[in-house]
């Protein structure tokens, strides 16, 4: 039985040209995390394998940094980065847990007033 839950940063906003940390946390389970995948709807951004380390997809290599921890840092944000991001926790023996984050990338002046999207 899967007892775990994923906490995420939820809906977040960031300024165009800036950077943002995508973070998920798996709790309420003793399952071993074997791998965390960071994905958009149709493509893989990065993988953090517990044993083998990080893999960053080539199309994101210049703009994605691994960490902190199992999180992912997106840099040099553009408006096209707006959308859903998923953290997929592969665990043993539970299976797969998925968390969702919605990122809105705003023009500089708008972002200053976009705090309502920020989850502390």
């Amino acid at each position: 039985m899967m007892t775990g839950t994923i906490e995420t940063t939820g809906n977040i906003s960031a300024e165009k040209g800036g950077s943002i940390i995508l973070q998920c946390h798996l709790s309420s389970t003793t399952a071993q995390v074997t791998q965390v995948n960071w994905e958009q709807q149709d493509q893989l951004l990065a993988i953090c394998n517990a044993d083998l380390g990080w893999h960053i997809s080539p199309s994101f290599k210049d703009r994605v940094a691994p960490g902190p921890g199992l999180g992912l840092t997106l840099q040099s944000l553009t408006v096209n980065d707006t959308g859903e991001y998923f953290c997929i926790y592969h665990t043993y023996p539970d299976g797969t847990y998925t968390g969702r984050i919605f990122l809105e990338v705003l023009e500089s002046s708008v972002a200053e007033h976009g705090a309502r999207f920020q989850i502390p």
Epitope: T34, Q35, N37, E39, D42, Q43, L44, I47, N49, A50, D51, L52, G53, W54, H55, I56, S57, P58, S59, K61, P66, H90
Partner: antibody, heavy 119, light 107 residues
Framework: QVQLVQSGAEVKKPGASVKVSCKTS????????LHWVRQAPGQGLEWIGG????????SYAQKFQGRVTMTVDTSTSTVYMELSSLRSEDTAVYYC????????????WGQGTLVTVSS | DIQMTQSPSSLSASVGDRVTITCRAS??????VVWYQQKPGKAPKLLIY???YRYTGVPSRFSGSGSGTDFTFTISSVQPEDFATYYC?????????FGQGTKLEIK
């Protein structure tokens, strides 16, 4: 340039163990993950497992769990793969392969080591 | 484990022909697929990764595409040195798995 040089061919009896080495050069040893892939005669490629030289972390295919051990010697930039309880089906060419910085595709390959298991 | 099913298993072509090999994953692997070429008695060589980037030094006649579960590898104009066996591989999750291979032979 990146080079992976493997130890020579081995002939083993069923039930024995074999230890194959893969000496690397031409890059910073701890930057690339190293994997072992085997190929039985006339067959396809099969991933055995991988090791992260940075921390010694290993990931093995379930099929080989309990029979395979991968280790690193950072002083000589060498990776080892030991396979125990050998059977005839383990007869294959064993390759070490390196995946680049933040990558899992196998860009660098050793020349292969033929392991023959025969009574 | 994720199964990678490659087709066809063998293929005959003439120099100059366009050939296409397909690989189907048993589950969504996003864009985490690579293609290798192997000649008899030699180690495989990385050609295409993720799944449309050509590796350093790989000629432009080799290309790859796809996402999710369906992937395609194409040689736009087969050259004599291209007769070999080609493998797809997924690295979305361990254990990393390969297709069974496609042998490209001279017609």
């Amino acid at each position: 340039q990146v080079q992976l040089v493997q130890s020579g061919a081995e002939v083993k009896k069923p039930g024995a163990s074999v230890k194959v080495s893969c000496k690397t050069s031409g890059y910073t040893f701890t930057e690339y993950t190293l994997h072992w892939v085997r190929q039985a005669p006339g067959q396809g490629l099969e991933w055995i497992g991988g090791i992260n030289p940075n921390n010694g972390g290993t990931s093995y295919a379930q099929k080989f769990q309990g029979r395979v051990t991968m280790t690193v010697d950072t002083s000589t930039s060498t990776v080892y793969m030991e396979l125990s309880s050998l059977r005839s089906e383990d007869t294959a060419v064993y390759y070490c392969a390196g995946s680049g910085y933040y990558d899992y595709s196998f860009a660098y390959w050793g020349q292969g080591t033929l392991v023959t298991v025969s009574s | 484990d994720i199964q990678m099913t490659q087709s066809p298993s063998s293929l005959s072509a003439s120099v100059g022909d366009r050939v296409t090999i397909t690989c189907r994953a048993s589950q969504d692997v996003k864009n985490a697929v690579v293609w290798y070429q192997q000649k008899p008695g030699k180690a495989p060589k990385l050609l295409i990764y993720s799944p449309s980037y050509r590796y350093t030094g790989v000629p432009s006649r080799f290309s790859g595409s796809g996402s999710g579960t369906d992937f395609t590898f194409t040689i736009s104009s087969v050259q004599p040195e291209d007769f070999a066996t080609y493998y797809c591989q997924q690295h979305y999750s361990t254990p990393f798995t390969f297709g069974q291979g496609t042998k490209l032979e001279i017609k």
